[in-house]
């Protein structure tokens, strides 16, 4: 007998989600309009392509990357899409309200959709730490809180630290990682007896997770270059990200083999480590002056990622209740920090070169900015975790963790699909 979607959630989820969608539609009706300018059509297509790359990364890349659980692959992919769709809508409104609302209307451009997709991507990174332990109603809450927190963080950083779009969006790695880890810390941790098999990876879902990793790998240069202000910077960002992810793939596969006593390659290590270079160069991808430096960073990031994947899951499983295959959270937290450190080092080298005696000031501001991102991520993550623990959401029972059958209708009730 298949376990039915809990009765209370069957009432709660559609009501909650559709009411929210109706509210969003009303907000769009009253407060938004499209950019009226007659753009150059070629430019419009080019601009749309970047947004399309980001959507592919989010929907296919992150959707499939989190689908490696034996009995939770359907939910991983579909819930990711649900969160992306909801997150983009709320992010567009929020960004408009925070940045351009005094004019009375929020103007929607392809750039604002690009920005919103990147904001929603933050949720998809964070959710890796909690997927399988929450239902859709809870994920709606998570989307709303995280997108709001990230939007406000970006506005505060922009105003206080005078950072541009690229710089304040590149905190997404660290922010999303710490947000997800703090939410996971609040949720019921122990995996009850009888569910150990469910958080294990299976061959076919693992293959789809690899497919997700491949899509992310292909489009990461678009992500790192999407918000830069000039074609020179975008070109540098694309090149440097490409070199970094290329090297991190080689490092991930060889490092994974090195880390295993029999020299075997771990699927889980490879899934996340192939992306390591892209995360590590994200903040400074437009500044790196030559390919070799990007490649060295890709190498270091790949090694850190494999090392982290080998030694951190035990700790994360015990303390945060995160399964071994959900390593995106701590991976991104380490690599995001690495990226921020690299940016500060480059800043210092530039300042020393210019001889303008501003090193202390710059380092202090950069550390302040990073600290603010981490603090807001942890605080909003803990708040979300506490909210998700409320009985109103009818969270899945621990015995139903990592189980597609709780949420999906399977005509033949197969267990090992």
């Amino acid at each position: 007998m298949s376990s039915k979607y809990p009765r209370s959630v069957r009432r709660c989820l559609p009501l909650w989600a559709l009411t929210l969608e109706a509210a969003l539609i009303l907000l769009f009706y009253f407060f938004t309009h499209y950019d009226a300018s007659l753009e150059d059509q070629k430019g419009l297509v080019a601009s749309y392509q970047v947004g399309q790359d980001l959507t592919v990364m989010a929907a296919i890349g992150l959707g499939f990357l989190t689908s490696s659980f034996r009995r939770h692959s359907w939910s991983s992919v579909a819930f990711n899409l649900f969160m992306l769709a909801l997150g983009v809508q709320w992010a567009i409104l929020l960004d408009g309200f925070l940045s351009q609302f005094p004019s009375g209307k929020v103007v929607i451009t392809l750039f604002s959709i690009r920005l919103a997709t990147m904001s929603a991507l933050s949720v998809l990174i964070s959710v890796d730490a909690v997927l399988g332990k929450v239902n859709l109603a809870q994920l709606v809450v998570m989307v709303l809180v995280e997108v709001t927190a990230l939007g406000n963080l970006r506005m505060v950083i922009s105003n206080i630290f005078n950072t541009d779009y690229h710089m304040n969006m590149m905190h997404i790695y660290v922010f999303a990682a710490y947000f997800g880890l703090s939410v996971a810390w609040c949720l019921p941790k122990p995996l009850p007896e009888g569910t150990e098999d469910k958080d294990q990876t299976a061959t076919i879902p693992s293959l789809s997770a690899m497919l997700g990793a491949l899509f992310l790998w292909m489009f990461w240069p678009s992500f790192n270059s999407a918000l830069l202000r000039s074609p020179i910077e975008r070109k540098n960002a694309v090149f440097n990200t490409y070199y970094a992810v290329a090297v991190s793939v080689v490092t991930a596969i060889s490092g994974s083999s090195l880390a295993h006593p029999q020299g075997k390659i771990s699927k889980t290590y490879v899934h996340s480590a192939v992306l390591a270079g892209g995360v590590a160069v994200g903040t400074s991808c437009h500044l790196i002056p030559s390919p070799w430096l990007a490649m060295v960073l890709g190498l270091v990031a790949g090694l850190i990622s494999v090392g982290g994947a080998k030694y951190l899951p035990g700790c994360c499983n015990r303390v945060l209740g995160i399964p071994h295959s959900s390593i995106m959270g701590y991976n991104f937290s380490l690599l995001g920090l690495l990226g921020e450190i690299i940016y500060i080092v480059l800043l210092v080298l530039d300042t020393v070169g210019a001889g303008n005696g501003m090193i202390g000031f710059q380092v202090l501001l950069s550390i302040g900015e990073l600290s603010l991102a981490i603090v807001i991520a942890l605080m909003s993550g803990l708040l979300t975790g506490l909210l998700l623990n409320l009985k109103i959401w009818k969270a899945p029972h621990e015995a139903k963790y990592f189980d597609d059958q709780v949420f999906w209708k399977f005509p033949h009730l197969a267990v090992g699909f």
Partner: antibody, heavy 129, light 112 residues
Framework: QVQLVESGGGVVQPGRSLRLSCAAS????????MHWVRQAPGKGLEWVAV????????YYADSAKGRFTISRDNSKNTLYLQMNSLRAEDTAVYYC??????????????????????WGQGTTVTVSS | DVVMTQSPLSLPVTPGEPASISCRSS???????????LNWYLQKPGQSPQLLIY???NRASGVPDRFSGSGSGTDFTLKISGVEAEDVAFYYC?????????FGQGTKLEIK
Amino acid sequence: QVQLVESGGGVVQPGRSLRLSCAASGFTFSSYGMHWVRQAPGKGLEWVAVIWFDGGNKYYADSAKGRFTISRDNSKNTLYLQMNSLRAEDTAVYYCARDASVLSGLVTRRLVYYGMDVWGQGTTVTVSS
Amino acid sequence: DVVMTQSPLSLPVTPGEPASISCRSSQSLLHRNGYNYLNWYLQKPGQSPQLLIYLGSNRASGVPDRFSGSGSGTDFTLKISGVEAEDVAFYYCMQGLRTPYTFGQGTKLEIK
């Protein structure tokens, strides 16, 4: 040499619309952000709007928000300013200007954007009934 | 918005004498990268503005070395070491740190 030529100005009644154009030559137009700046008769300079090199992002002065729209056609090397619901206080000489940046990093390839470096000769818009 | 205040608004100078124009901003224009996002523009009668000094102290190409910019944070100065007749113009400071970009009211330099 680098040149910006504005056109489209004229006399218009309050509440009506006008579209200004700025033709660029002598540089790779599609690689630069562009601005509109205006100067009311006998007054100082007032920044109106900026658009990124690919048209992706735009910013406006409070006085222009909701009424003016900056756009560009990179295939024609042309910048536009669509002005709707014009008011008497919009009477001014309108200049287009190129976004200025300098490569500053000795170690990195850091670009610093600081304002406008090249200006057009301006086109006059008079809003009067 | 960042408010830019120039002084004096009118500056009569004898040819060959030095001249100094002050510009103050309501917020610091010193960016974390160490640059001050302040530019000086001059506008000769009947002409469009042209860039004189950028990022606080850098002369634009073709600008004579008698023009110099200094200052940091909120207080900036444009100096002309020896005024010439052709320097008669309006001088504007502008902050390029954040949008909306804002200009000072302008200083009219005239020959005594």
